[in-house]
């Protein structure tokens, strides 16, 4: 059975217009966070605020799904650690990055360890 996906949403801003077609949510910067979604209905166009979740892996039905490697070591200088995700699946019309880098703060424990290592002059 064919699945109906990427459907247009009815109503929406200026709902005197019968059928609005909405594009994907495009973050204002980087790969996630607050952004805008453009809609068209006949000659009318609208932009609405939207949010692309930064928690790509857990977000059900996200436009872009990634397979992530393990978190890297804590960087004592920035207090963050990084991991890379490779595109696993994209919604048909979603213009997803092939790879993304996600950063998160180190836990206090790993931060302390990283600082201790740095203090000992180790890489």
């Amino acid at each position: 059975v064919a699945k109906k996906k990427d459907k247009v949403k009815k109503g929406g801003p200026g709902s005197e217009c019968a059928e609005w077609a909405w594009g994907p949510c495009t973050p204002s910067s980087k790969d996630c966070g607050v952004g805008f979604r453009e809609g068209t209905c006949g000659a009318q166009t609208q932009r609405i605020r939207c949010r692309v979740p930064c928690n790509w892996k857990k977000e059900f039905g996200a436009d872009c799904k990634y397979k992530f490697e393990n978190w890297g070591a804590c960087d004592g200088g920035t207090g963050t650690k990084v991991r890379q995700g490779t595109l696993k699946k994209a919604r048909y019309n979603a213009q997803c990055q092939e790879t993304i880098r996600v950063t998160k703060p180190c836990t206090p424990k790993t931060k302390a360890k990283a600082k201790a290592k740095k203090g000992k002059g180790k890489d």
């Epitope: 594009g23 453009e38 019309n93 092939e98």
Partner: antibody, heavy 117, light 107 residues
């Protein structure tokens, strides 16, 4: 860059099912939707359906629901389309294409299917 | 299903002239409209995606406009290698559909 290889031609007898192949090489096959398109002699393009290799999610044109079955084999980077009970109406060129909304698509050169006894 | 109507069916031009090809959708499809070129015996080649987005390796003389229901592919100055059949395709909803094509021929 993705390259898609399809056999140039296939001959099948009416009523005998046939399985067309589309082998991908180059960038990751499993990340992108694989489309199948039919073009009858002297005619336009007709979308049959698509499959996503990562989880085999399939979206089929209802017109082809009793005709085409799409599958993938991740281990060999190959997509397949099986056509059941072919008739002379199914004689056409069948293309596969790998779609990414970000970079565009890549097409195979097409398989000319001839249904004849 | 969404019906795409292309016009004209045939367009006769000389090299160097400007080509304007039209594709009209039976309902609004946002910017989910793509343009392909096909030459005899070859697979289609993507020229423009999402109404106006350019494709790597495609000459700058090809451009597209939208969104909504009326879309245009423009070839600013037709080259001899541009004579072919051009198809529009929508990806706004299933099934994906193609227009009937416009044949660009030498005058």
């Amino acid at each position: 860059q993705v390259q898609l290889q399809q056999p140039g031609a296939e001959l099948v007898r009416p009523g005998h099912s046939v399985k067309l192949s589309c082998k991908a090489s180059g960038q990751s096959f499993s990340s992108y939707w694989m489309n199948w398109v039919r073009q009858r002699p002297g005619q336009g393009l007709e979308w049959i359906g698509m499959i996503h290799p990562s989880d085999s999610e399939t979206i089929l044109n209802q017109k082809f629901k009793d005709k085409a079955t799409l599958t993938v084999d991740i281990s060999s980077n190959t997509a397949y389309m099986q056509l059941s009970s072919p008739t002379s109406e199914d004689s056409a060129v069948y293309f596969c294409s790998s779609w990414s909304a970000k970079r565009g698509d890549f097409w195979g050169q097409g398989t000319t299917l001839t249904v004849s006894s | 299903e969404i019906v795409l109507t292309q016009s004209p069916a045939t367009l006769s031009l000389s090299p160097g002239e400007r080509a304007t090809l039209s594709c009209r959708a039976s309902e609004s499809i946002s910017n989910n409209l793509h343009w392909y070129q096909q030459k005899p015996g070859q697979a289609p080649r993507l020229l423009i995606k999402y109404a106006s987005q350019s494709i790597s390796g495609i000459p700058a003389r090809f451009s597209g406009s939208g969104p909504g229901t009326d879309f245009t592919l423009t070839i600013s100055s037709v080259e001899p290698e541009d004579f072919a059949v051009y198809y529009c395709q929508q990806s706004n909803s299933w099934p994906l559909t193609f227009g009937g094509g416009t044949k660009l021929e030498i005058k």
